[in-house]
């Protein structure tokens, strides 16, 4: 028998520095977690103690903090090289700055293979990107070899900016021939490493003949065997065992997100490459694990540029940006409109001639808007200003909801109106009218939504049975502020870009902004 240790991360999302327990900015260092310096300490400890170790990343290193905003992926290549990752799969967020924003900072600089079997380049891009990412990689480990085959969510064109010269194929269809090639080469230990979410990970384990282990990402799935060490609630045991169609037991793993945990899986193979046993657990990277001094020093060196960036002007406002709780928790506020407009603008993807865009609607809890921005400071807007407005380090995500769920969400928005509570929704691509004289749960008297399958966008009444795409904060997607109906009834959820980054990019693009209060939210006569 031959034993392999797989160390894995996924959805790190630019958390190069240690974070608080909820993966936001570290405040009290003695209680902070994760970060590449601490990760390196643990990885090195395991490498020294065990003979056959692979360190893998399942995608979405890009996007999530000011580190990515400023360094645009160069930080990912630098620190992943320093940690000596063995392989990485491409995630959807790796395309956030377009293909060039992937090629130059990461693909050309990474000293480890970057993988995806289901992304095919065409046209002029084919020769430019050739060899910079691979469908699979054969890695020597000790006296054996391990094949690693990569995959990426086929929804990436809707979630990011891969352009028109990359085709995202069905994962299973694309993986099988590559696994077959590895088998042809007598590589009999094969890991599928990818970024399509836990459901797809399980399907790959079930359907792709020859895959021995699946290491996934995208869905931020936390798996754990025994008592979990922090706040995350396990979605199942670690590893999650799937019985394949040809009768093999295939371990599937994921390690939550944000570099909070290091996935740790031990696999025992027989001489024919069959998995005999698998066990392990994610390792919580808490403050009991010291930060490696050399990596920490490097982080501090790179950090300097971030501090300078946060005070630079992104653009100007010529109007007061009303982000006060007195406005945003009671009525339409122009800060809410600005943020929602930025959220939609960030999700412009012309992937189908029938649709002007795949999504037109935004909802945003008023309680998530934490500060106004005064235009009387020469109109200057900085990252620092936006960090005061959106201090929680969240993301603006894409969900699919039925009309009936949206109606419930808008009823919840005003179910206890008048108490300055955070659930009051700011909107984009939606016209809502409330009648507060009616009883809670029946206050939405008009709800019109902007069409997507149209050449001239216009507002149509919400259809209860129709499925709509909506951009919203991850806080709402996870049921925050009492929006349990969103969490319970959503049909799909894909995590998006860092909230501040979305707004800062929009302001930089527009240069000068002047959002108005324009009648997106109305109250019927006599009730307000």
């Amino acid at each position: 028998a031959w034993e392999l240790t797989i160390l894995h991360t996924n959805d790190v999302h630019s958390r190069l520095e240690q974070t608080s327990e909820d993966s936001s900015k570290c405040v009290n260092a003695s209680r902070c977690m994760g970060g590449v310096a601490r990760l390196f300490t643990k990885v090195q400890q395991i490498r020294r103690a065990e003979p056959n170790v692979l360190l893998l990343d399942a995608g979405d290193q890009y996007q999530g903090t000011i580190w990515f905003t400023v360094y645009k992926g160069a930080e990912v290549a630098h620190f992943m090289n320093a940690l000596r990752y063995d392989a990485m799969a491409l995630g959807n967020h790796e395309f956030d700055n377009g293909v060039e924003g992937l090629i130059e900072p990461l693909l050309k600089e990474a000293k480890f293979p970057i993988l995806s079997a289901n992304i095919k380049a065409k046209g002029p891009l084919a020769s430019q990107i050739s060899g910079l990412y691979l469908p699979y990689k054969v890695l020597p480990v000790g006296d054996e070899v391990v094949g690693i085959v990569g995959y990426t969510s086929k929804e990436t064109p809707f979630l990011s900016n891969p352009g028109t010269n990359l085709v995202f194929e069905d994962e299973i269809t694309a993986l099988q021939p590559e696994v077959d090639k590895l088998k042809t080469l007598n590589v009999n230990k094969i890991i599928a490493l990818g970024h399509s979410g836990f459901e797809m990970d399980k399907l790959i384990a079930q359907k792709v003949r020859g895959v021995d282990v699946v290491v996934g990402g995208h869905s931020n799935t936390f798996l754990y065997t025994g008592n979990p060490p922090s706040k995350e609630v396990p979605a199942g045991k670690y590893p999650f065992i799937v019985t394949s169609d040809d009768g093999r037991k295939v371990p599937v793993v994921q390690a939550y997100a944000f570099g909070k945990y290091l996935g740790y899986l031990k696999i025992e193979f027989d001489e024919r490459g069959n998995v005999i046993s698998s066990h392990g657990n994610p390792i919580l990277l808490n403050s009991s694990i010291p930060e490696d001094p050399s990596i920490k020093a490097d982080i501090n060196k790179w950090r300097i540029k971030l501090d300078n960036y946060s005070t630079q002007e992104l653009g100007k406002t010529i109007v007061y940006l009303d982000g006060s709780s007195q406005s945003c928790r009671f009525r339409e506020c122009n800060m809410g409109n600005l943020i929602c407009d930025a959220m939609i603008n960030n999700n412009l993807r012309h992937t189908d001639e029938m649709f002007w865009n795949h999504v037109s609607m935004c909802i945003l809890n008023g309680g998530g808007i934490r500060s106004p921005i005064d235009e009387r400071n020469n109109g200057t807007i900085t990252w620092e200003n936006l960090a005061a407005v959106l201090p929680f380090g969240g993301t603006f995500d894409l969900v699919q909801l039925k009309g009936s769920t949206l109606k419930k969400a808008f009823e919840h928005s005003v179910h206890r109106y008048g108490q300055s509570t955070g659930e009051f929704l700011q909107v984009g691509g939606i016209h809502v009218v409330y009648d507060l004289s009616r009883k809670p749960g029946d206050r939405v008297v008009k709800l019109d939504v902007l069409c997507t399958k149209c050449r001239v966008p216009s507002y149509d009444p919400l259809k209860m049975d129709e499925v709509y795409k909506v951009i919203l904060p991850n806080f709402l997607a996870n049921g925050g502020d009492g929006f349990q109906m969103i969490k319970d009834e959503l049909l799909r959820h894909d995590s998006g870009d860092q909230d501040i980054n979305v707004v800062s990019t929009y302001i930089s693009k527009m240069k000068v902004i002047y959002p108005a209060v324009e009648g997106r939210i109305k109250f019927s006569t006599g009730s307000h």
Epitope: A110, V145, L185
Partner: antibody
């Protein structure tokens, strides 16, 4: 675009050793396999061995296990092959070639001509 | 060891013609076959891998086919610059082995 620059022609005496070098650029050395191949005049190619630059793992054609030793220096992105106990049968052009997996050679050096003669 | 046999050491063709170079493996190699072109005084150059996948930048007049034991490299609309030796190689099992080569001459 990747390049592999091999050391110059060698004229050596039988029974001695020689170390050939192959300096690479334009691709990620640490995640590449470097193979060495032999081509006698007007003949086909023979694969000698590969080395995985990232780890130093090697795999040899059994025919050459006592003849060749392959190494890498990652700091200079250079691969080396030492040939020992040379005879006239070792006179050939030796190529280094890059492959990212256990498959095709996508970049080749220009070749080093080795002549073993007394 | 797997023996790769290129039965024609020499082949003659004219500009604009179509020519097929064959390669036979002594045992099943699946599609783990690659074709190289070597011009006089130069290093080999990759043309086809996995029996039929054309390498980036290789003109589409070069086509590979076959699986198992029989493989073919087909050149359509032959050009004068195609004068070269053509080698097949298997990477199904160690040691990797090459065919003896086919020298294509242009009449």
């Amino acid at each position: 675009q990747g390049q592999m620059q091999q050391s110059g022609a060698e004229l050596v005496k039988p029974g001695t050793s020689v170390k050939l070098s192959c300096k690479t650029s334009g691709f990620t050395f640490s995640s590449s396999y470097i193979s060495w191949l032999k081509q006698r005049p007007r003949q086909s190619l023979e694969w000698i061995a590969w080395i995985y630059a990232g780890t130093g793992n090697t795999n040899y054609n059994q025919k050459f296990t006592d003849k060749a030793q392959v190494t890498v220096d990652t700091s200079s992105s250079t691969a080396y092959m030492q040939l020992s106990s040379l005879t006239s049968e070792d006179s050939a052009i030796y190529y280094c070639a890059r492959h990212v997996n256990w498959d095709y050679f996508d970049y080749w050096g220009q070749g080093t001509t080795l002549t073993v003669s007394s | 060891d797997i023996v790769m046999t290129q039965s024609h050491k020499f082949m003659s063709t004219s500009v604009g013609d179509r020519v097929s170079i064959t390669c036979k493996a002594s045992q099943d190699v699946g599609t783990a076959v690659v074709w190289y072109q070597q011009k006089p005084g130069q290093s080999p150059k990759l043309l086809i891998y996995w029996a039929s996948s054309r390498h980036t930048g290789v003109p589409d007049r070069f086509t590979g086919s076959g699986s198992g034991t029989d493989f073919t490299l087909t050149l359509t609309n032959v050009q004068s610059e195609d004068l070269a030796d053509y080698f097949c190689q298997q990477y199904r099992s160690y040691p990797w082995t090459f065919g003896g080569g086919t020298n294509l001459e242009i009449k």
